[in-house]
Amino acid sequence: EDELQVIQPEKSVSVAAGESATLRCAMTSLIPVGPIMWFRGAGAGRELIYNQKEGHFPRVTTVSELTKRNNLDFSISISNITPADAGTYYCVKFRKGSPDDVEFKSGAGTELSVRAKPS
């Protein structure tokens, strides 16, 4: 069976300040078991934007119902975008582990740019 792929179809998205940004991500498989996380940036300093497993992310909503059986859509929407939100966002699949989940595969990233709010 083919190994899971993380698909971020848009290389870039441009949003006006104050609006919401939709960042799309899809998986090609339900296996392996483990959560999805979204990060801004990569490397040691990457910023956690959304964790399917736990946490409070008031500006983030999921586009589809993640708990729905056989769901493969892990797109998110971030509200009230500001220039500080600009950057490259990665959708990352983790494999369930003990004691910690392990990064399994990442999408190629979607660069979010922020336009000035229309006057």
Epitope: G43, A44, E47, A84, G87, T88, S106
Partner: antibody
């Protein structure tokens, strides 16, 4: 341009808590991560931890039990507390800015020497 | 933790000559999703904070002279000063920011021969 300035006592007694503040001037604290790094006299660099303006933190496991980093976005400041200090914590302490979009710590404060001694 | 090993500990180079510093990481710092190596190089002069020279292993920071260049991928990296100037006398550090904890090499002291 953006500048970082560390402040705090230069002398701390053993077993007490070291407290330093880094003030970010000329720019916003948003969008970057803000690190503390230390350098014992004549030695190399050791990363202590970082914080985002959201308050999310990441600490060096070797110091995690003694370290707290906090942020005050209204004052454009972030702070370091290191508890139960010993002479081994004597070092120049630097604050620095990191960019998760590129990598590397691209802006550093001048550093402040903290001596642990009774 | 990722261990960063620099060599040599020190080197003396004549003015105008090439200086080469090596850095080896105990595991790869290449992120396959964006094909970037999370490896940076810093210059530190006495009494001053470190200054970022290179990030992503080979991208020069703004304002850094082009005699400084970085190369390598995965676990093996090199900082080259193509023509050493008197103001380049300093200690140079490599650093990985691929995984936390962020870690630095032990430093290489560059002097004039």
């Amino acid at each position: 341009q953006v500048q970082l300035q560390e402040s705090g006592p230069g002398l701390v007694k053993p077993s007490e808590t070291l407290s330093l503040t880094c003030t970010v001037s000329g720019g916003s604290i948003s969008s970057y991560y803000w690190s503390w790094i230390r350098q014992p006299p004549g030695k190399g660099l050791e990363w202590i931890g970082y914080i985002y303006s959201s308050g999310s933190t990441n600490y060096n496991p070797s110091l995690k039990s003694r370290v707290t980093i906090s942020v005050d976005t209204s004052k454009n400041q972030f702070s370091l507390k290191l508890s139960s200090v010993t002479a081994a914590d004597t070092a120049v302490y630097y604050c620095a800015r990191g960019d998760s979009s590129s990598g590397g710590l691209d802006l550093w404060g001048r550093g402040t020497l903290v001596t642990v001694s009774s | 933790d990722i261990v960063m090993t620099q060599s040599p500990d020190s080197l003396a180079v004549s003015l105008g000559e090439r200086a080469t510093i090596n850095c080896k990481s105990s595991q790869s710092v290449l992120y396959s999703s964006n094909n970037k190596n999370y490896l940076a190089w810093y210059q530190q002069k006495p009494g001053q904070p470190p200054k970022l020279l290179i990030y992503w292993a080979s991208t020069r920071e703004s304002g850094v002279p082009d005699r400084f260049s970085g190369s390598g991928s995965g676990t093996d990296f090199t900082l080259t000063i193509s023509s050493l100037q008197a103001e380049d006398v300093a200690v140079y550090y490599c650093q990985q920011d691929f995984l936390t904890p962020i870690t630095f090499g032990g430093g290489t002291k560059v002097e004039i021969k």
